[in-house]
Amino acid sequence: FEIALPRESNITVLIKLGTPTLLAKPCYIVISKRHTTMLSIKPGERILFTFSCQSPENHFVIEIQKNIDCMSGPCPFGEVQLQPSTSLLPTLNRTFIWDVKAHKSIGLELQFSIPRLRQFGPGESCPDGVTYSISGRIDATVVRIGTFCSNGTVSRIKMQEGVKMALHLPWFHPRNVSGFSIANRSSIKRLCIIESVFEGEGSATLMSANYPEGFPEDELMTWQFVIPAHLRASVSFLNFNLSNCERKEERVEYYIPGSTTNPEVFKLEDKQPGNMAGNFNLSLQGCDQDAQNPGILRLQFQVLVQHPQNESNKIYVVDLSNERATSLTIEPRPVKQSRKFVPGCFVCLESRTCSTNLTLTSGSKHKISFLCDNLTRLWMNVEKNISCTDHRYCQRKSYSLQVPSDIFHLPVELHDFSWKLLVPKDRLSLVLVPAQKLQQHTHEKPCNTSFSYLVASAIPSQDLYFGSFCPGGSIEQIQVKQNISVTLRTFAPSFRQEASRQGLTVSFIPYFKEEGVFTVTPDTKSKVYLRTPNWDRGLPSLTSVSWNISVPRDQVACLTFFKERTGVVCQTGRAFMIIQEQRTRAEEIFSLDEDALPKPRFHHHSFWVNISNCSPASGKQLDLLFWVTLTPRTVDLT
């Protein structure tokens, strides 16, 4: 190899050992029979050399640095060449460095030809291995503007007082152009300006200078976004830290087209604007930091550009002004993310404060709009607390658990509407009475309606799930001892059509000791499947639950248990089942941990089934499934 550098080129070449590898044989640079591991070539020098091994790219790297002095003479502006040409260089990993020094009053602009640049953060790398590292200067301090790959949106970076640009090319890369040019501009009066150009839908992730370390104290950095007129942009902060300010306040400022309040100033912790049409600027302003405990300011954010939907021009009013203790959240459905670009899906408050999820609280009217390619990507969850503090006032008081019609006007699907029903401990209990009798969801007879009621304890320490219930069954009411949550969960968009079938009434009733009581009136046409609460996890320790099963006068009920034995093993206590005829009060008691369950049996009159659990050994829980069928009486047995 021969490398010759012209005397006035201001280029130095350095060949040195790269990161050490575990290769057995060492490799050397050979210059007139002398072996060395480092070679420096200065302007005006011409050197012939070879390598002592077959694959020097595994051992050495080459750095080509060109110093451009714009302080003492005119600047060589225009397209930057790779000098010496890559064809003259040995095939090593190579880094071209351009170090441009300029006056503070001079602005320097790096312009990147298509496919432009994409900034990447710590721990990431470029697919093709081609990397741009760009730094600026504040007095004598070097500031990292960022590291970039190809295929992005960054088209220009403006700085002042000097630029250091490093282009890293892997040894196998055929590239022979720098891909950028330098131009001079007037002073930008800030650390830097990064221009990001979107041609169509897409996203860009950008970072403050020195990221993930701290942004320089009291500095200003600006990003200019060029957005096609027919698209909308939304900003979301992925990660940020605030420093400890002594004077001034850290903030971001937006220049948004059409805004009457430019610049719009936001704190970093605020929701950032979305649904913006046209070009806009975003600036990060630092503060004077506390000398003793400065902390760090840093910001990583994303700009998402997408087509507006028809819905984004509509304003929806959600009136929660007459509601109490209610919150409505619109959020993304959980989905597997694909690797390709996915347009953002935002919900906007007052059209501008857009985010991926939004919670509205009771007591106000809210105006919302959507910026989303497909509104089925969102769903709605509502929580409402109904509590009783004074048992004398609440007793026998009833509330209707009904989804307000306002919610059906919104263009997103309702997922859950949860009512948290809270009662004074040991003073009152609750009864749920459905508008239509309920069916308990079981594997044997699953619910196939568009919605179900999920009933569970709302006591933090208690893991008790009564079950999932849907309209069209035999359960007339559910009584529960203490605090519960009732969640109406929808399973299909057809819920809007079936909404009339929903409706539960909750009443506060005198306190009782059992965890739950189900009142069941079987249908003559079908089997009623019933199962103990907490199915698959087992009825909680020492819990008692009952079923009050009505048998019509002209019918006989057959009670059948799914298994011969429960399989429960008691660590302490015994588990009992008591079947009691309501007319005669005659009862049969079964020790569930010791004895077999009864064979199918016939009841001519209404009866109770009560199950009281022990403290089961782990893995040997009490789960019981049984069913009731009615058949007409053939003989009058009264």
């Epitope: 009992f576 005659a586 009862e587 008691i589 010791e594 009281s612």
Partner: antibody, heavy 124, light 107 residues
């Protein structure tokens, strides 16, 4: 009123067998676990065996395991204790006792009604 | 097995006085302890279960307390018919075990 009446006691030679019966009335027999408890002359109470209400589980004291068998016939409201390989130390008054059902209930049995006892003497 | 130890073996008290019988378990039996009374020539009678719950028809002068390994049966005011033998029984673990008994006699 709960009544328990033991029968079948008597004198038997060591190595011999005896079958005690306990006839129950005044309660739904199949609902309740039952036990046998014995008392040697001038000594304290010693639990012997127990059986669950439907006969699905049986329990024995180590001193009688393998020699005594507890069983029940719920259709006849009767509890049994088959005693084989009898030893002199098995000499005692044998009481049959009914379990109390308390919900939630303890693992073992609490005896809330007792028979008057059947005397068993093992002697040559 | 769990060994139940009652103390004292015999307790002499005057009628009308207060008396306390003790029962100690060799390991914890939680509250799974019962007390029985046995009169001469009769079957035992259940007094207390669950360490402190009086059985049906048992007068209020009998009370039980304790949990774990230490239990007591207390008579608030002894009647003449109370001077008989008392047994404690644990039912926390198999086998069920009784104490050796305490005889209450008139002083």
């Amino acid at each position: 009123e709960v009544q328990l009446l033991e029968s079948g006691g008597g004198l038997v030679q060591p190595g011999g067998s005896l079958r005690l019966s306990c006839a129950a009335s005044g309660f739904t027999f199949s609902n309740y676990a039952m036990s046998w408890v014995r008392q040697a002359p001038g000594k304290g109470l010693e639990w012997v065996s127990a059986i669950s209400g439907r006969g699905g589980s049986t329990y024995y004291a180590d001193s009688v395991k393998g020699r005594f068998t507890i069983s029940r016939d719920n259709s006849k409201n009767t509890l049994y204790l088959q005693m084989n390989s009898l030893r002199a130390e098995d000499t005692a008054v044998y009481y049959c006792a009914k379990d109390i059902v308390v919900v939630p209930a303890a693992k073992g049995y609490v005896m809330d009604a007792w028979g008057q006892g059947a005397s068993v003497t093992v002697s040559s | 097995e769990i060994v139940m130890t009652q103390s004292p073996a015999t307790l002499s008290v005057s009628p009308g006085e207060r008396a306390t019988l003790s029962c100690r378990a060799s390991q914890s039996v939680s509250s799974n302890l019962a007390w029985y009374q046995q009169k001469p020539g009769q079957a035992p009678r259940l007094l207390i279960y669950g360490a402190s719950t009086r059985a049906t028809g048992i007068p209020a002068r009998f009370s039980g307390s304790g949990s774990g390994t230490e239990f007591t049966l207390t008579f608030s005011s002894l009647q003449s018919e109370d001077f008989v033998v008392y047994y404690c029984q644990q039912y926390n673990n198999w086998p069920l075990t009784f104490g050796q008994g305490t005889r209450l006699e008139i002083k």
